[in-house]
C-alpha cells in the first residue's frame, strides 16, 4: 500500500479458499484456513495422501481434505479392498465352453478338454504328445489328432503296413485298409464275392464286403 493510503490487513481479505482473516497488528494478519488448506493465505491444498489406506495396488488421488483410491481393474471399494467378480462383469471371459471361476484379485478359467490358456482360447497342440509313426504327418484337432500316412503305411498311428499295396482285390474291387489291424478289406463289384473278389455269386446278390 502507498504511504498516502490507509492499509487495513483484512480489507479486502487476502485469505483464499474460504479462509477467514484476523488482524494481528497494524499491518499484519493471520488466515484461519478451512480443513484441507494451508499457507499464509490458505492458498495451498494439503496433500492427504501421505497416510493413505489404498490397498492392492490402489493409487491415492488427493482431494480437498480427503483422498480417493484409484483401483486396479481387479479391485473396487473405497480402499480397493473389495474383489471385482470378473465372471459377473464379463460373461464371455472364458471361451470355448470354459468355466469362469472368480478369485480374490482376479479370475481363472477351467477349460474343457482340448483347450488351454488364460481364457481357453488356445487349442492344445495334441500333436506335441502324439505318437504318429515317423514319416507320417500329424494333424491337430480339438482334443484329438489324426495321422496322415505315407504310401505303404496304414493304421491310426501309421504303424502298420498297408495291405492294399499288393493289390489283393480283383475284378476292379475297392481296397480299404482296416485302421486297427492293417488288413485289407475288398468291396467287391456286383457279381463277385470272396476275400479278394474272385468268386462268382448268384444273381440278385448285391455288393459283398470281405475282410482279410
Amino acid at each position: 500500500a502507498g504511504s498516502d493510503s490507509l492499509y487495513v490487513p483484512c480489507a479486502p481479505s487476502p485469505c483464499v479458499n474460504g479462509g477467514t482473516c484476523r488482524q494481528t497488528g497494524d499491518f499484519t494478519f493471520e488466515c484461519n484456513c478451512l480443513p484441507g488448506f494451508e499457507g499464509s493465505t490458505c492458498e495451498r491444498n494439503i496433500d492427504d495422501c501421505p497416510n493413505h489406506r489404498c490397498q492392492n495396488g490402489g493409487v491415492c488421488v488427493d482431494g480437498v481434505n480427503t483422498y480417493n483410491c484409484r483401483c486396479p481393474p481387479q479391485w473396487t471399494g473405497q480402499f480397493c479392498t473389495e474383489d471385482v467378480d470378473e465372471c459377473l462383469l464379463q460373461p464371455n471371459a472364458c471361451q470355448n465352453g470354459g468355466t469362469c471361476a472368480n478369485r480374490n484379485g482376479g479370475y481363472g478359467c477351467v477349460c474343457v478338454n482340448g483347450w488351454s490358456g488364460d481364457d481357453c482360447s488356445e487349442n492344445i497342440d495334441d500333436c506335441a504328445f502324439a505318437s504318429c509313426t515317423p514319416g507320417s504327418t500329424c494333424i491337430d484337432r480339438v482334443a484329438s489328432f489324426s495321422c496322415m500316412c505315407p504310401e505303404g503305411k496304414a493304421g491310426l498311428l501309421c504303424h502298420l503296413d498297408d495291405a492294399c499295396i499288393s493289390n489283393p482285390c480283383h475284378k476292379g474291387a475297392l481296397c480299404d485298409t482296416n485302421p486297427l489291424n492293417g488288413q485289407y478289406i475288398c468291396t467287391c463289384p456286383q457279381g463277385y464275392k470272396g476275400a479278394d473278389c474272385t468268386e462268382d455269386v448268384d444273381e440278385g446278390n448285391s455288393h459283398h464286403h470281405h475282410h482279410h
Epitope: G39, S40, E43
Partner: antibody, heavy 120, light 107 residues
Framework: EVQLVESGGGLVQPGGSLKLSCAVS????????MEWIRQASGKGLEWIAA??????????VYSASVKDRFTISRDTSKSTLYLQMNSLKTEDTAVYYC???????????WGQGTLVTVSS | DIQMTQSPSSVSASVGDRVTITCQTS??????LAWYQQKPGKSPKLLIY???RLQDGVPSRFSGSGSGTDYTLTISSLQPEDFATYFC?????????FGGGTKVEIK
C-alpha cells in the same frame, strides 16, 4: 524493503556437511512460510524444503531428494533461516536460494543465492 | 507430485514481438500458478501469481491466463530487457514444482 541474503556456500567433499544461512529483513519473519530452492548450473529450479509460519507451528516439509539428509530451521530472534546439509552428494552441487512464500501461490522475494560445490 | 510441462524450451523473437509461453500441469491446480523471470547470474523474479495477478512493479505487458491444467504467460510487446529465461511454478500443493524453463532469445 524486503531483503534475503544467503551465505555459507562453498566446496565440500562427498559425504560432508555444510550449513547455509539466510538473513532476512523488512518483514515479520514469523508470519511467512520460507522455502529453499536450488538450481544446478544451466538447469531448472528445484524446490527442496519449506518451513511453515508460526501460525502453523513452524512445521516442515521436504522433497524426497533431500529428506533425512537436509534440515530446515529458523531462529526468529536472529531473523535467519538455515539449511543444514549432511551426507552431501555430487548431485547436490547447485546454487541454493532461500525465498519468502508470499501466499497466493507466489514466491515473492528471493535471496541472491549461494553456490554449493560437492566434489572430491 | 504434480508434473509441469513448459513449452517451448526456447524461442527466438525480436523487440516488439508478442511472445506466448505455455505450462501444462499433470492435475488441476485451481489457478495456483506463478511465473518467474530469471536473468543469467541472477535470482528469479516473481512476475505473475495466482495464474493471472500481476506482481507489484511488473510492467503491464506481462499477463497470465489459464485455469485447470493449462496456463499461459504472454509478453504483448517484447522489450530489450525481457530477454531472459521464464519459469512456471505450481503452488497448489507440496512439493512445489517448476516447469523446465523457456529461454527467450534475440532473433
Amino acid at each position: 524493503e524486503v531483503q534475503l541474503v544467503e551465505s555459507g556456500g562453498g566446496l565440500v567433499q562427498p559425504g560432508g556437511s555444510l550449513k547455509l544461512s539466510c538473513a532476512v529483513s523488512g518483514f515479520t519473519f514469523s508470519d511467512f512460510y520460507m522455502e529453499w530452492i536450488r538450481q544446478a548450473s544451466g538447469k531448472g529450479l528445484e524446490w527442496i524444503a519449506a518451513q511453515r509460519n508460526k501460525a502453523n507451528d513452524f512445521s516442515i516439509v521436504y522433497s524426497a531428494s533431500v529428506k533425512d539428509r537436509f534440515t530446515i530451521s529458523r531462529d526468529t530472534s536472529k531473523s535467519t533461516l538455515y539449511l543444514q546439509m549432511n551426507s552431501l552428494k555430487t548431485e547436490d552441487t547447485a546454487v541454493y536460494y532461500c525465498s519468502r512464500d508470499g501466499g497466493r501461490w507466489g514466491l515473492d522475494a528471493w535471496g541472491q543465492g549461494t553456490l554449493v560445490t560437492v566434489s572430491s | 507430485d504434480i508434473q509441469m510441462t513448459q513449452s517451448p524450451s526456447s524461442v527466438s523473437a525480436s523487440v516488439g514481438d508478442r511472445v506466448t509461453i505455455t505450462c501444462q500441469t499433470s492435475e488441476d491446480i485451481y489457478s495456483g500458478l506463478a511465473w518467474y523471470q530469471q536473468k543469467p547470474g541472477k535470482s528469479p523474479k516473481l512476475l505473475i501469481y495466482g495464474a493471472s495477478r500481476l506482481q507489484d512493479g511488473v510492467p503491464s505487458r506481462f499477463s497470465g491466463s489459464g485455469s485447470g491444467t493449462d496456463y499461459t504467460l504472454t509478453i504483448s510487446s517484447l522489450q530489450p530487457e525481457d530477454f531472459a529465461t521464464y519459469f512456471c511454478q505450481q503452488g497448489f500443493k507440496y512439493p512445489l514444482t517448476f516447469g523446465g524453463g523457456t529461454k527467450v532469445e534475440i532473433k
